[in-house]
């Protein structure tokens, strides 16, 4: 699995809704693949981490002043929806095909 | 300044183009305010860090399994341009009013 020593990448993160207390309103699925962005944003930032100009600048400043400025951070840059069966305001089981922003599609350095 | 103990916020980061080796092609300014996003993404994530659903989920999973899953990360969520006088391909000083993505406008938890 991607640790601090490896470069920024998407790794598996299975989330159980009961663990986070969302089982009170999400009926199904019981768990889903959320993914997580893990790893470091090391110099030089590769194209696959789609760095912004600011991330490139911050990486260069960190290189010169590592104690003063932090590295860019490996975060989700694109998210995907999942389908959920949830309880609506009245508690009635209701299907949302596209519950946006729940799963990582892409990671990058920001 | 905002450290790991404080919550995610925008802090000052003056960048000198000579320090990062960009003075070879950026003529002016000599330095600029890039800002940096610093601080932690602690539970509960406040509205001002505009968390995505994934960031909220990851924060809740981190709360339950702190050694297995990291916190969401404080990163730039909106960037601003700066104006630069640079040398074009032929070395001619050229003004770019909007050199995009160089300065942090907003920080958030992602």
């Amino acid at each position: 699995s991607a640790g601090a020593g490896s470069h920024c990448q998407k790794t598996s993160l299975r989330v159980n809704f009961e663990d986070i207390g969302w089982d009170s309103w999400i009926i199904a699925p019981k768990e889903y693949e959320a993914y997580e962005c893990k790893g470091g944003c090391f110099f030089p930032l590769a194209d696959d981490v789609t760095p912004t100009k600011h991330a490139i600048v911050q990486t260069l400043v960190h290189l010169k002043f590592p104690t003063k400025v932090g590295k860019a951070c490996c975060v989700p840059t694109k998210l995907s929806p999942i389908s959920v069966l949830y309880k609506d305001d009245m508690g009635v089981p209701t299907l949302k095909y596209h519950y946006e922003g729940m799963s990582v599609a892409e990671c990058g350095c920001r | 300044s905002a450290g790991a103990g404080s919550h995610c916020q925008k802090t000052s980061l003056r960048v000198n183009f000579e320090d990062i080796g960009w003075d070879s092609w950026i003529i002016a300014p000599k330095e600029y305010e890039a800002y940096e996003c610093k601080g932690g993404c602690f539970f509960p994530l406040a509205d001002d860090v505009t968390p995505t659903k994934h960031a909220i989920v990851q924060t809740l999973v981190h709360l339950k399994f702190p050694t297995k899953v990291g916190k969401a990360c404080c990163v730039p969520t909106k960037l601003s341009p700066i104006s630069v006088l640079y040398k074009d391909d032929m070395g001619v000083p050229t003004l770019k009013y909007h050199y995009e993505g160089m300065s942090v406008a907003e920080c958030g938890c992602r």
Epitope: P29, D88, M90, G91 | -
Partner: antibody
Framework: QVQLVQSGAEVKKPGSSVKVSCKAS????????IHWVRQAPGQGLEWMGG????????YYAQKFQGRVTITADESTSTAYMELSSLRSEDTAVYYC???????????????????WGQGTLVTVSS | QSVLTQPPSVSGAPGQRVTISCSGS????????VYWYQQLPGTAPKLLIY???NRPSGVPDRFSGSKSGTSASLAITGLQAEDEADYYC???????????FGGGTKLTVL
């Protein structure tokens, strides 16, 4: 236009099981919940349970818990209701009814049972 | 015994107005929408009113629904012979997590 067509009448012995089918045509099966409602002779309507085929999630009225199983086959757009340990009081007409579950539909209509199947008479007799 | 209470029967002459009441509690009618179904002799029920007071297409405007507190009612004006049927009210019960029906009201057109 959505239509629900149910299987034919059944005569069963006490203690046995019955499985009634409900085939949907028209519309998108994954947008539905299929519910089962029964009506004993000369009596009112009684909700038994429902299933959301998209996730295969079923929920039941307490009264029938453990005795009823509702399933669905998305490939054939068919829902099934199986009732076990039959007794004479289970003699009734069993109806399937659609409820739209997708939240892209206004909540007022989303909670309605519409349309209904033609009904299946199940007679439990020794 | 049904969770929602309806009168067993009502009657009226052709052209008259009749109302059918449906009484519930705070966990069903009091907090959720009410639905009315018409069941003609020997046929399956048919949706008549949805969301308290909405008519599906094809249902004459002689039929109207209303709700106040924990009670609802169905009004039929200009009574016709073909209105002779059983009428059922229905709502979701938030507390019990079930769909509940009234016992049904038999309408006789004199």
């Amino acid at each position: 236009q959505v239509q629900l067509v149910q299987s034919g009448a059944e005569v069963k012995k006490p203690g046995s099981s019955v499985k009634v089918s409900c085939k949907a045509s028209g519309g998108t099966f994954s947008d539905y919940a299929i519910h089962w409602v029964r009506q004993a002779p000369g009596q009112g309507l009684e909700w038994m349970g429902g299933i959301i085929p998209f996730f295969g999630t079923a929920y039941y009225a307490q009264k029938f818990q453990g005795r009823v199983t509702i399933t669905a086959d998305e490939s054939t757009s068919t829902a099934y209701m199986e009732l076990s340990s039959l007794r004479s009081e289970d003699t009734a007409v069993y109806y399937c009814a659609r409820r739209i579950v997708s939240d892209s539909v206004a909540v007022q209509y989303r909670h309605a049972f519409d349309p209904w199947g033609q009904g299946t008479l199940v007679t439990v007799s020794s | 015994q049904s969770v929602l209470t309806q009168p067993p029967s009502v009657s009226g002459a052709p052209g008259q107005r009749v109302t059918i009441s449906c009484s519930g509690s705070s966990s069903n009618i009091g907090s959720n929408y009410v639905y009315w179904y018409q069941q003609l002799p020997g046929t399956a029920p048919k949706l008549l009113i949805y969301g308290n007071n909405n008519r599906p297409s094809g249902v004459p405007d002689r039929f109207s629904g209303s709700k106040s507190g924990t009670s609802a009612s169905l009004a039929i004006t200009g009574l016709q012979a073909e209105d002779e049927a059983d009428y059922y009210c229905n709502a979701w019960d938030t507390k019990a997590y079930v769909w509940v029906f009234g016992g049904g009201t038999k309408l006789t057109v004199l």
